[in-house]
């Protein structure tokens, strides 16, 4: 008795983070014995799509000509061979950017910071959000998420860095998102260049883990009164 069919490999080209309106191709690669490929999307009727294999039958292509909110989500694929259906692939999370207007990213007290000192990156959104992501250019994953604890929505999130070292220097952007779909992100903020000067060196800095709140000062511009609960944001390190 042969074991279960090996699970296929699932990936997206040009990548799994796609701007609104752009095209994306999802690939499912199984074996040469595959007769049919099936793509399932979480929380959608299964199957989401079926495709015949492309020669030499070991993979199938699922095309999305124009990315919209409906396509964002978590996918798995399967293939059918003469002996039955395979195990599901590992999930692919297809994320759409451009769902909301871009937030603004600031460095306080300044984007010019001396090594050993502290700096806070502040990400502010136009509409209340419950998740904020900080990205450093050329980093493999989001530096961190800030997610509100009770679905409470905030207009901003603080990302403290202390003590700052030369490793913190670089270009940052932030995104904001709603809890009802973390597969939908805002446009990226304009880039923020953090410049670290000084001689204090620490090759493996420890990021600050203090909880940030979105409560701004009294003069916080254009934040509607009463709409920003003063609940904390929970930090998730990636």
């Amino acid at each position: 008795q042969a074991g279960p069919l090996p699970k296929p490999t699932l990936w997206a080209e040009p990548g799994s983070v796609i701007s609104w309106g752009n095209s994306v191709t999802i690939w499912c690669q199984g074996t040469l014995e595959a007769r049919e490929y099936r793509l399932d999307k979480e929380e959608s009727p299964a199957p989401w799509d079926r495709q015949n294999p492309l020669e030499p039958k070991n993979k199938a292509r699922f095309s999305i000509p124009s990315m919209t909110e409906d396509y964002a989500g978590r996918y798995r694929c399967y293939y059918r061979s003469p002996v039955g259906w395979s195990q599901p692939s590992d999930p692919l999370e297809l994320v759409m950017t451009g769902a909301y207007s871009k937030p603004t990213l600031s460095a306080l007290p300044s984007p010019l910071v001396t090594s050993g000192k502290s700096v806070t990156l502040l990400c502010q959104s136009r509409s209340p959000m419950d998740t904020f992501l900080l990205i450093k250019e050329r980093a493999a994953h989001p530096l961190l998420h800030l997610r509100s604890e009770h679905g409470a929505q905030q207009h901003q999130a603080e990302f403290p860095m202390s003590p700052v070292t030369s490793v913190h220097g670089g270009t940052y952007r932030c995104f904001s998102s709603h809890g009802f779909s973390h597969y939908l992100l805002s446009h990226p903020s304009d880039p923020l260049e953090l410049i670290v000067s000084g001689s204090l060196e620490d090759p493996r800095p420890s990021p600050t883990r203090s909880v940030s709140t979105a409560a701004g000062p009294e003069d916080q511009p254009l934040m509607p009164t009463g709409s920003v609960p003063h609940s904390g944001l929970r930090r998730h390190w990636e």
Epitope: W20, Y100, S101, P103, T104, S106, P109, L122, R126, Q220
Partner: antibody
């Protein structure tokens, strides 16, 4: 590309109402606030208010409160502005504009409303 | 309401020369929360809708030529066109987005001398 296409020119009598539409395309419609801005002939710009298509939230300039109503039809990616009890001072070009972070990064072509008896 | 006052009301500048437009707000537009100035500049050509040039007082919108530059902080702001081109003939508006209601300056008409 982002496009905001407004309805055509209107001529109304004093006391009547006018409803101007703004159809959005080229972006994720529900995630961006849409504002309306008034420009009388040869004059400057005046903010009227906004609507957030995602949930229909509105906010109006006090000067227009009670006479303006903004609505949204998500199925057609269209927002509407209705102005009632029209008077001659309402003669203007009305623009819809997409908000970025309280500033406006895309504008409709404008709709001329003429109020004349 | 925050009152925005532009100067001059009109301006005539020779092609290739520098044009400077000023904008003054009745209260500071600098946020203590993020150290940004909540001010934008728009260009409106005859018969057209306004077009965003500058936001956060000095950030140029994508696609805007680098001859356009914004500066200033607090209550005093400037839009500078370093070398005037024929296509820059327009009315220019500043706008504050620090507090509601959003307000604009009265506009500055820029012409070729």
């Amino acid at each position: 590309q982002v496009q905001l296409v407004q309805s055509g020119a209107e001529v109304k009598k004093p006391g009547a109402s006018v409803k101007v539409s703004c159809k959005a395309s080229g972006y994720s419609f529900t995630g961006f606030y849409i504002d309306w801005v008034k420009q009388p002939p040869g004059k400057g710009l005046e903010w009227i208010g906004y609507i957030f298509p995602s949930n229909g939230e509105t906010s109006y300039n006090q000067k227009f409160k009670g006479r303006v109503t903004m609505t949204v039809d998500k199925s057609t990616s269209t927002v509407y502005m209705e102005l009632s009890s029209l008077r001659s001072e309402d003669t203007a070009v009305y623009y819809c504009a997409r908000q970025a972070f309280y500033y406006f990064d895309s504008w409709g072509q404008g709709t001329t409303v003429t109020v004349s008896s | 309401d925050i009152v925005m006052t532009q100067s001059p009301d009109s301006l005539a500048v020779s092609l290739g020369e520098r044009a400077t437009i000023n904008c003054k707000s009745s209260q500071s537009l600098l946020s203590s929360s993020n150290q940004k100035n909540y001010l934008a500049w728009y260009q409106q050509k005859p018969g057209q809708a306004p077009r965003l040039l500058i936001y956060w007082a000095s950030t140029r919108e994508s696609g805007v030529p680098d001859r356009f530059a914004g500066s200033g902080s607090g209550t005093d702001f400037t839009l500078t066109i370093s070398s005037l081109q024929a296509e820059d003939v327009a009315v220019y508006y500043c706008q504050q987005y620090y507090s509601y209601p959003l307000t604009f300056g009265q506009g500055t008409k820029l012409e070729i001398k």
